[in-house]
Amino acid sequence: GSTVPPMVNVTRSEASEGNITVTCRASSFYPRNIILTWRQDGVSLSHDTQQWGDVLPDGNGTYQTWVATRICRGEEQRFTCYMEHSGNHSTHPVPSGNSHHHHHHHH
């Protein structure tokens, strides 16, 4: 099949006091190989500070996955989600506290 670029969506949720969990989801992409990882101030976070979902079929012949990490509230602007798929790449910021969803479709 032809390349289908992912939809990338960054959300935040309350974790413990002073911390939030930020999750970067990629969906509706093909082929299944995708890089999704968090950066802080442009530097990659270690594997042991991130949690990944498996790359799973979403029922439409395309795939979905996610990566999450826990950060200190107030430091959201230091973190970005990096996505690389089929030679295309993009970075996605954490939404501010009053906005919980950012959707981007990449071509």
Epitope: I35, H47, D48, G53, V55, Y82, E84, G87, N88, H89
Partner: antibody, heavy 120, light 107 residues
């Protein structure tokens, strides 16, 4: 066929800088990361740093102040520059393609390496 | 940095033998471990990633296992072309670090 090939100066004088080029084929640098690893004679392997598809770089903090990694996507070349070389920088320098998929991160194809000797 | 220790610097075995190479990490690495083979001419090849996954083209006589801090690589039936040094590598924390290597020789 995925290939990487390093080319370097061979001999570098102490306190001088080192420049090595990694020329790749069979894949695009916009869609893959490239790592640099070195091996001093008779010793183990040491990761130096990497450059991602978007040009962002990560470095080994022990060497970060002396290292610079860059690339030219159109020429399929990745460059390693290291400053202030000393004799303990004598090593074989490898470039290797990185595969970074979720919980899996590995160096799936390596160049043959280029030997760098630091000596006056 | 995480220290990776391969306590056996070299070992001698006969062709057809089962060979096990051990690797220990200075802290838990959550299966974030790869193995590489370095031939005498310096050529490096990926053997196993994420503790136990074999890349395509790697013979099935190679296998990997482990968890927490302790990992191993097993060659079930030593062949002449397996004469090489073997390195473990963790990627749980940056920087990725390698063990000191285990050299396998023929008796």
């Amino acid at each position: 066929q995925v290939q990487l090939k390093e080319s370097g100066p061979g001999l570098v004088a102490p306190s001088q800088s080192l420049s090595i080029t990694c020329t790749v084929s069979g894949f695009s640098l916009t869609g893959s990361g490239v790592n640099w690893v070195r091996q001093p004679p008779g010793q183990g392997l040491e990761w130096l740093g990497m450059i991602w598809g978007d040009g962002n770089t990560d470095y080994n903090s022990a060497l970060k102040s002396r290292l610079s990694i860059s690339k030219d996507n159109s020429k399929s070349q990745v460059f390693l520059k290291m400053n202030s070389l000393q004799t303990d920088d004598t090593a074989r320098y490898y470039c290797a393609r990185g595969a970074h998929y979720g919980k899996r991160w590995y160096f799936d194809v390596w160049g043959a390496g280029t030997t760098v000797t630091v000596s006056s | 940095d995480i220290q990776m220790t391969q306590t056996t610097f070299s070992l001698s075995a006969s062709l057809g033998d089962r060979v096990t190479i051990s690797c220990s990490a200075s802290q838990g690495i959550n299966n974030y471990l790869n193995w590489y083979q370095q031939r005498p001419d310096g050529t490096v090849k990926l053997l196993i990633y994420y503790t136990s996954t074999l890349p395509s083209g790697v013979p099935s006589r190679f296998s990997g296992s482990g968890s927490g801090t302790d990992y191993s690589l097993t060659i079930s039936n030593l062949e002449p072309e397996d004469i090489a040094s073997y390195y473990c590598q963790q990627y749980s924390k940056l920087p990725p670090t390698f063990g000191g290597g285990t050299k396998v020789e023929i008796k």
